[in-house]
Amino acid sequence: LPSCKEDEYPVGSECCPKCGPGFHVRQACGEQTGTVCEPCSPGTYIAHFNGLSKCLQCQMCDPAMGLRTSRNCSTTANALCGCSPGHFCIIQDGDHCAACRAYATSSPGQRVQKGGTESQDTLCQNCPPGTFSSNGTLEECQHGTKCSKWLVTEAGPGTSSFRWV
């Protein structure tokens, strides 16, 4: 292969000018002609100067996998996915998330000590003696002397399955 300049790409034993971001090569250059570039079609992109014959497919942000689109795809930049509401990222991959997980659900007998964020789970805490939380959604446990047995019983933390991006 020939050693081409940074703004060129190899074609056989020759070098041709690259296409700009948002364009792909429709026809390689010839002796008398430059590279023929064609715009990327909707749903595809190329972010850099390139010698590609096809644009790259935009990634899809699948809500079923706990994802939402945080940046729409353009012809010059791929879409970015973030975690959907109620989910947080457990593995980061560059500028996007490799795995989302649903927030833990605080159980009866627990309070929400700290709400979940984009990168952190909900933090649950057991209610202190003499207080209760009937559904685990409260930020403060309620004082009560007539709790039924099932409310006094300490419940384990909620669980939910991993959602991957």
């Epitope: 790259l56 497919q57 990634q59 899809m60 942000c61 699948d62 996998m65 994802l67 996915c81 947080f88 990222c89 457990i90 593995i91 980061q92 991959d93 560059g94 490799a98 795995a99 997980r101 990168s119 952190q120 789970d121 933090l123 991993f162 991957w164 991006v165």
Partner: antibody, heavy 115, light 107 residues
């Protein structure tokens, strides 16, 4: 039930090649990033790389120690992950795990590189 | 690459005692940290993810804390089956590096 089963380990001479396989089941393979991790006899764990999921065009990422020598690929129709290892060195001797990091790992397959 | 420094490399303790293992990251990693347990001849098993969240089916005697660069992993009342090896792993940026491991031994 999620299952990952590695195979293909064995004894190879320095400079040789080998391909490891990881058969998976119990989840939608195309939705997940899949990784290879190795553990040397000295017990250190080393992340080798991953192949992204369908949404991310199955692109790959490698650690510096194996980049250019190892290639991760996947057969999505059979739900199999591969690790092609070329120009093997004595220091590549280890137990190799495929993983759906962080929650599911295979049982591992052992590679010995020795003359 | 982000270096993960895990300490101690080994620790002796008695049944019923509490132990704490520390992992220091060479740069800030938010809460993108996992802790694994590994039994002899077996693959690592996830105990904690996102620094503090307990993986499904893991007993509540295991807990994780910390964010940024300093992380701790605690076993509150050691059982016989806990005397094995433990590893941290950062999941902030590739390569997803591991700590050197901690081997727990019975006193």
């Amino acid at each position: 039930e999620v299952k990952l089963v590695e195979s293909g380990g064995g004894l190879v001479q320095p400079g040789g090649s080998l391909r490891l396989s990881c058969a998976t089941s119990g989840f939608t393979f195309t939705d997940y990033y899949m990784s290879w991790v190795r553990q040397t006899p000295g017990k250190a764990l080393e992340w080798l790389g991953f192949i992204r999921n369908q949404a991310n065009a199955y692109t790959t990422e490698y650690s510096v120690s194996v980049k250019g020598r190892f290639t991760i690929s996947r057969d999505n129709s059979q739900s199999i992950l591969y690790l092609q290892m070329n120009t093997l060195r004595v220091e590549d001797s280890a137990t190799y795990y495929c993983a759906r990091v962080p929650d599911y790992w295979g049982q591992g397959t052992t590679l010995t590189v020795s003359s | 690459d982000i270096q993960m420094t895990q300490s101690p490399a080994s620790q002796s303790a008695s049944l019923g005692e509490s132990v704490t293992i520390t992992c220091l990251a060479s740069q800030t990693i938010g809460t993108w940290l996992a802790w694994y347990q590994q039994k002899p001849g077996k693959s690592p098993q996830l105990l904690i993810y996102a620094a503090t969240s307990l993986a499904d089916g893991v007993p509540s005697r295991f807990s994780g804390s910390g964010s940024g660069t300093k992380f701790s992993f605690k076993i509150s009342s050691l059982q016989a089956e806990d005397f094995v090896s433990y590893y941290c792993q950062q999941l902030h940026s590739t390569p997803y590096t591991f700590g050197g491991g901690t081997k727990l031994e019975i006193k």
